[in-house]
């Protein structure tokens, strides 16, 4: 009979789809995530099973609290799509799908730098490539540790472009790019590239 | 070159056990499922059990309990244990890969071995 | 247990002819198509012809085709060649109780 009933909740609201979610969206190859499968009804004991496509992962029980599956993405296939299923004696639903983006950390970007001099200023050009990563690709200029351009959004592999002008400094200043991409807290830094003072003949990156 | 060869049949005699086996080449076991299906002489075929990928298995009705599956990863091999064997477990069983994720889409199979269970 | 029934358990057909095989599930599969579709040659292993219920596999002819979906499915062989002479058979996938396969019984198809 409790079957008969719990099909017949089913029916109603009172049974509705799990679902299934993820704090991690984006996601690099060999990391771990868990996904949670979760019901509105905290007052059933429920069966959750979590699938692949056409593969099934697992199965747990829980009542009130989601089921946890962890996971290791170590394969492209493994980005989904994901369903699981919320089982209560002989009566089912399924939530809907859910997949993950598997993006490619971000290499060390490198920087260059080129300089035009005149007698008064420096034309400063910075070009930051990072030549491994998923596009798009952030990069961020910063001299003295301190940020001086906009996120410069690339979307093929080509070196971004900041360009500043400078009175001629007294001090030397260093300068390093951020590369980034939809990884969240993964940012790169290239090693930085220090700008001698002007005394004398020296800006080795000067054109002449 | 992707394939499966069975090995482990033969003559049993009924109560006995056999352990049968499925070396896998040309692909891992830790991203592919291999399924045991077996065939009766004039018969249909017949499924077995089941390991995925993550190692999990499942096992028709039928042969829960009398019949168990393993995987040994080093090798790149999967078994088949036969227990408490009978005259109706005389068959020719095959070991089949799955497609990615898809456990019984089933495109990759061996030559099969003929396990005769007769005292 | 789940039941799946094909039917004709044997037909007898002419080169050329359209076959068509059934395959009844007593459950709706996973997914509402997790069949596929397999042929068999005497002392051969099975070769798989359909999957997802409709998908060609990789190799095999256009004049195959499946369709179906839930407990309902049909392969047809839109002109049978004399190769097609062989037993066909359905395999079900399902979750219902416990992550479950079933194959059909088989299905002959002879030379007229």
């Known amino acids: 009979r409790k079957a008969v009933l719990d099909c017949e909740a089913m029916k109603t609201n009172e049974f509705p789809s799990p679902c299934l979610d993820s704090k991690t969206k984006v996601v690099m190859k060999g990391q771990n995530v868990s996904m949670f499968c979760s019901h509105k009804n905290k007052s059933l004991q429920i069966t959750y099973s979590l699938f692949r496509r056409k593969t099934h992962l697992g199965t747990q029980d829980g009542k009130g609290e989601p089921a946890i599956f962890n996971l290791s993405i170590t394969e492209a296939h493994e980005s989904g799509p994901y369903k699981c299923k919320a089982q209560v004696t002989s009566c089912s639903k399924y939530s809907r799908d859910f997949s993950f983006t598997i993006v490619d950390p971000v290499t060390s970007p490198v920087l260059n730098i080129m300089v035009i001099q005149t007698e008064t200023d420096r034309h400063i050009t910075l070009h930051c490539l990072s030549v491994n990563g998923s596009l798009p690709i952030n990069y961020t200029f910063f001299e003295n540790h301190v940020a001086i351009s906009p996120a410069i959004s690339k979307y093929d592999r080509e070196p971004a472009e900041f360009n500043l002008t400078k009175k001629n400094p007294g001090e030397e200043e260093e300068y390093r790019c951020e590369a980034k991409n939809r990884l969240p807290n993964y940012a790169t830094y290239s090693h930085p590239v220090t700008m001698p003072s002007t005394g004398g003949d020296s800006c080795p990156f000067c054109l002449k | 070159e992707v394939q499966l060869v069975e090995s482990g049949g033969g003559l049993v005699q009924p109560g006995g056990s056999l352990r049968l086996s499925c070396a896998a080449s040309g692909f891992s076991l830790t991203i592919y499922t291999i399924t045991w299906v077996r065939q009766a002489p004039g018969k249909c075929l017949e499924w077995i059990g089941t390991?995925?990928?993550?190692?999990?298995?499942y096992y028709s009705t039928w042969a829960k309990g009398r019949f168990t599956i393993s995987r040994d990863n080093s090798k790149n091999t999967v078994y088949l244990q036969m227990n408490s064997l009978r005259a109706e477990d005389t068959a020719v069983y095959y070991c089949?890969?799955?497609?990615?994720?898809?456990?019984?889409?089933?495109?990759?199979w061996g030559q099969g071995t003929l396990v005769t269970v007769s005292s | 247990a789940i039941q799946m029934t094909q039917s004709p358990s044997s037909l007898s057909a002419r080169v050329g002819d359209r076959v068509t095989i059934t395959c009844q599930s007593s459950?709706?599969?996973?997914?509402?198509?997790?069949l596929s579709w397999y042929q068999q040659k005497p002392g051969k292993a099975p070769k798989l012809l359909i999957y997802?219920?409709?998908r060609l596999a990789s190799g095999v002819p256009s004049r195959f085709s499946g369709s179906g979906s839930g407990t309902q499915f049909t392969l047809t062989i839109s002109s049978l060649q004399p190769e097609d002479f062989a037993t066909y058979y359905c395999l079900g996938g399902y979750d219902s109780s416990g992550w479950y396969a079933a194959f059909g019984q088989g299905t002959k198809v002879e030379i007229k």
């Open positions: 997802d219920a409709s």
């Open positions: 459950e709706s599969v996973y997914d509402n198509n997790y």
């Open positions: 390991i995925n990928s993550y190692g999990n298995t």
């Open positions: 089949a890969r799955g497609y990615v994720d898809s456990d019984w889409y089933l495109n990759i």
